[in-house]
């Protein structure tokens, strides 16, 4: 999906008002220095591409973050503010099925969510030059 035509300011508002709090809740009990940020992004569409990938694609050691509250809110924000996102990224019938129970939080998942926090912070500061 091409995130170029999203309403970035509206997505930023959703992040600041609610998604960020859920990410913090997920990471509670973890030191902020525990994980190094290894995933980066260069501009807002790129950041959303990376956020989408880390949030919804299963990885080794962290099978699914998609059922977490921050992920459902991310999906909702993208569905609302990115034209055509729902049609290309979400199966309508899937969206209406009952959710499965949450997976156990692993250290790998915590590391992945820590990367997500970094990507979101970068998304919110698009004018900063890449380190």
């Amino acid at each position: 999906y091409d995130f170029t035509n999203c309403d970035f300011e509206k997505i930023k508002a959703a992040y600041l008002s609610t998604i960020s709090k859920d990410l913090i809740t997920y990471m509670s009990g973890t030191k902020s220095t525990e994980f190094n940020n290894t995933v980066s992004c260069s501009n807002r569409p790129h950041c959303l591409t990376e956020i989408q990938s880390l949030t919804f694609n299963p990885t080794a050691g962290c099978a699914s973050l998609a059922k977490e509250m921050f992920a459902m809110k991310t999906k909702a924000a993208l569905a609302i503010w990115c034209p055509g996102y729902s049609e290309t990224q979400i199966n309508a019938t899937q969206a209406m099925k009952k959710r499965r129970k949450r997976k156990v939080t692993t250290n790998k998942c915590l590391e992945q969510v820590s990367q997500l926090q970094g990507l979101w912070r970068r998304f919110n500061r698009p004018l900063l030059k890449q380190q």
């Epitope: 609610t18 909702a76 924000a77 569905a79 049609e87 979400i90 309508a92 209406m96």
Partner: antibody
Framework: QVQLVQSGAEVKKPGSSVKVSCKAS????????INWVRQAPGQGLEWLGV????????IYAEKFQGRVTITADTSTSTAYMELSSLRSEDTAVYYC?????????????WGQGTLVTVSS | QSALTQPPSASGSPGQSVTISCTGT?????????VSWYQQHPGKAPKLMIY???KRPSGVPDRFSGSKSGNTASLTVSGLQAEDEADYYC???????????FGGGTKLTVL
């Protein structure tokens, strides 16, 4: 069962405000969109706006911007639509309608409607 | 935004097919695959019949079908039955985050 139940009919004076409620049951309220649509007597359907409680997003139709306020109370699974500065042309049946999860623009469940009459 | 354009009336005999058109612009119907159709009987709330241009919710008979070409969407009711007599409204997502831009409605009469 899965339903939206709206508050009863209202009679209002021009210039006043009306607040209509819409109580959801049988589904996860926060995950869906709650849209408000009205229908004047003998006329077509007109969209007023939507709230997606999960992310606290509200969007209003340009025509009603500044005059309509949509809110939601997730603890009671209830959405509200308040319309201010009422005029006779606002006399209509007001419906709340559920927008599908992540596809908030498809209204797959409707309330029974609330008749709002604006008359002096 | 202006309302989508629908013919005020349409009719057909039982067993026949009827197609109702809904014309918009590239900012609504033409720009998004987010067209839906609603059936409304007198004194009742509308009911979703078609969404996503051509998808049918469960419980809606397969006699109802939807399509889109350019800026025009269409609803076809085949094998008309008496209970199909109702008002039909098209709706489209429109630019500027309008979730429901409706047509003026078409009164379908089963002769």
């Amino acid at each position: 069962q899965v339903q939206l139940v709206q508050s009863g009919a209202e009679v209002k004076k021009p210039g006043s405000s009306v607040k209509v409620s819409c109580k959801a049951s049988g589904f996860t309220f926060g995950s869906y969109g709650i849209n408000w649509v009205r229908q004047a007597p003998g006329q077509g359907l007109e969209w007023l706006g939507v709230i997606v409680p999960l992310v606290g997003v509200t969007i209003y139709a340009e025509k009603f911007q500044g005059r309509v306020t949509i809110t939601a109370d997730t603890s009671t699974s209830t959405a509200y639509m308040e319309l201010s500065s009422l005029r006779s042309e606002d006399t209509a049946v007001y419906y709340c309608a559920r927008g599908q999860e992540y596809f908030y623009w498809y209204f797959d469940l409707w309330g029974q409607g609330t008749l709002v009459t604006v008359s002096s | 935004q202006s309302a989508l354009t629908q013919p005020p009336s349409a009719s057909g005999s039982p067993g026949q097919s009827v197609t109702i058109s809904c014309t918009g612009t590239s900012s609504d119907i033409g720009g998004y695959d987010r067209v839906s159709w609603y059936q409304q009987h007198p004194g009742k709330a509308p009911k979703l019949m078609i969404y996503g241009v051509s998808k049918r919710p469960s419980g809606v008979p397969d006699r109802f079908s939807g399509s889109k070409s350019g800026n025009t969407a269409s609803l076809t009711v085949s094998g008309l039955q008496a209970e199909d007599e109702a008002d039909y409204y098209c709706s489209s997502y429109a630019s500027g985050h309008t979730f429901g831009l409706f047509g003026g409605g078409t009164k379908l009469t089963v002769l």
